[in-house]
């Protein structure tokens, strides 16, 4: 089936915004009023995965952008990037492990787990304006639960 | 050599669990996922859930509230049990494995175990 | 859910006949549509994924065709051993459906 995807923005749960640092990197930084416009809006595509009763396989790629977040090893270590692809072939309902989140709702709060590296989840530090990151823990300093919210396409 | 094996009482009374393990060799319960389908007798196939390499499980919803499936790796083990058995639920059960093949054939199910009869009477 | 319709529930045929057998998913499916045979009192087997791919093993006179909603499985000439019943199964997306199964038959 053609790939089903809808536009969204996303806040951590301390309400933190999410916007572009350069060409290749998100941060997380607190935004109000006008500046909310800076923030940026992700085409969440539903795609094939290793699905679930309680996960929901997405890959998250930047509203009329070539750039999709992605999860490789970077120095042995599990790594968040922003990877450029080719416009033609994406989105696609079977999109390479690399780009699949597993999008895990619990107390009206989402995670995004890394399908390539399990139980590893896109993070944002208490600090004001650092990257977003791969976490490898859940529940201590980093912040993994995001609010969604819904943009009319 | 892929093989898959499905072992259970083939008897089971009505309003008991009716519990089956898969054991498998060839391949590793880590890597791939592993699906129970079942077919009532001189019926068709229907799928009942499955089982991922993460552990991570989905079950197919009419029977999602009686159901847990299950896997121990190490034994290459995978179990499923289903609660509150009526007569409708007599049939032949069977395993098999993933494809797993991500980015392009995921969801399929390529080798399967011969399957075990159950039937659920008193 | 996806609902899949084969047809025809029953068929039977000669050996050295052609047959086809079809499946109509109820949304878009691609090409995620596989094709099982299965005789009595065994398992079944995958002999073809991904619409037309046949599966390693498999004999040249099966073939698959379909993109989307409709599918077509094909036995170019029938041989003793291919009188068994075949089912289709979606693999898009879960739950997985299977079609009804149709049962071919020595004529």
């Known amino acids: 089936a053609p790939v089903r995807s809808l536009n969204c923005t996303l806040r951590d749960s301390q309400q933190k915004s999410l916007v572009m640092s350069g060409p290749y990197e998100l941060k997380a930084l607190h935004l109000q009023g006008q500046d909310m416009e800076q923030q940026v809006v992700f085409s969440m595509s539903f795609v094939q995965g290793e699905e679930s009763n309680d996960k929901i396989p997405v890959a998250l790629g930047l509203k009329e952008k070539n750039l999709y977040l992605s999860c490789v090893l970077k120095d042995d270590k599990p790594t968040l990037q922003l990877e450029s692809v080719d416009p033609k072939n994406y989105p696609k309902k079977k999109m390479e492990k690399r780009f699949v989140f597993n999008k895990i709702e619990i107390n009206n709060k989402l995670e995004f787990e890394s399908a390539q590296f399990p139980n590893w989840y896109i993070s944002t530090s208490q600090a004001e304006n650092m990257p977003v990151f791969l976490g490898g823990t859940k529940g201590g300093q980093d912040i993994t639960d995001f609010t969604m919210q819904f943009v009319s396409s | 050599e892929v093989q898959l094996q499905e072992s259970g009482p083939g008897l089971v009374k009505p309003s008991e669990t009716l519990s089956l393990t898969c054991t498998v060799s060839g391949f590793s319960l880590s890597d791939y996922g592993v699906s129970w389908i079942r077919q009532p007798p001189g019926k068709g196939l229907e799928w009942i859930g499955l089982?991922?390499?993460?552990?991570?499980?989905y079950y197919n919803s009419p029977l999602k509230s009686r159901l847990t499936i299950s896997k121990d790796t190490s034994k290459s083990q995978v179990s499923l049990k289903l609660s509150s058995v009526t007569a409708a639920d007599t049939a032949v059960y069977y395993c098999a494995k993933q494809t797993n093949l991500w980015a392009y054939d995921l969801y399929s199910m390529d080798y399967w175990g011969q399957g075990t009869l159950v039937t659920v009477s008193s | 859910d996806i609902q899949m319709t084969q047809s025809p529930s029953s068929l039977s045929a000669s050996v050295g006949d052609r047959v086809t057998i079809t499946c109509q998913a109820s949304?878009?499916?691609?090409?995620?549509l596989n094709w099982y045979q299965q005789k009595p009192g065994k398992a079944p087997k995958l002999l073809i994924s991904l619409a037309s791919i046949l599966r390693p093993g498999v004999p040249s006179r099966f073939s698959g065709s379909g993109s989307g909603t409709d599918f077509t499985f094909t036995i170019s000439s029938l041989q003793p051993e291919d009188f068994a019943t075949y089912y289709c199964?979606?693999?898009?997306?879960?739950?997985?459906?299977f079609g009804q199964g149709t049962k071919l038959e020595i004529k």
């Open positions: 199964l979606q693999s898009d997306s879960f739950p997985l459906t």
């Open positions: 949304q878009d499916i691609d090409d995620d």
């Open positions: 089982i991922w390499g993460s552990g991570d499980t």
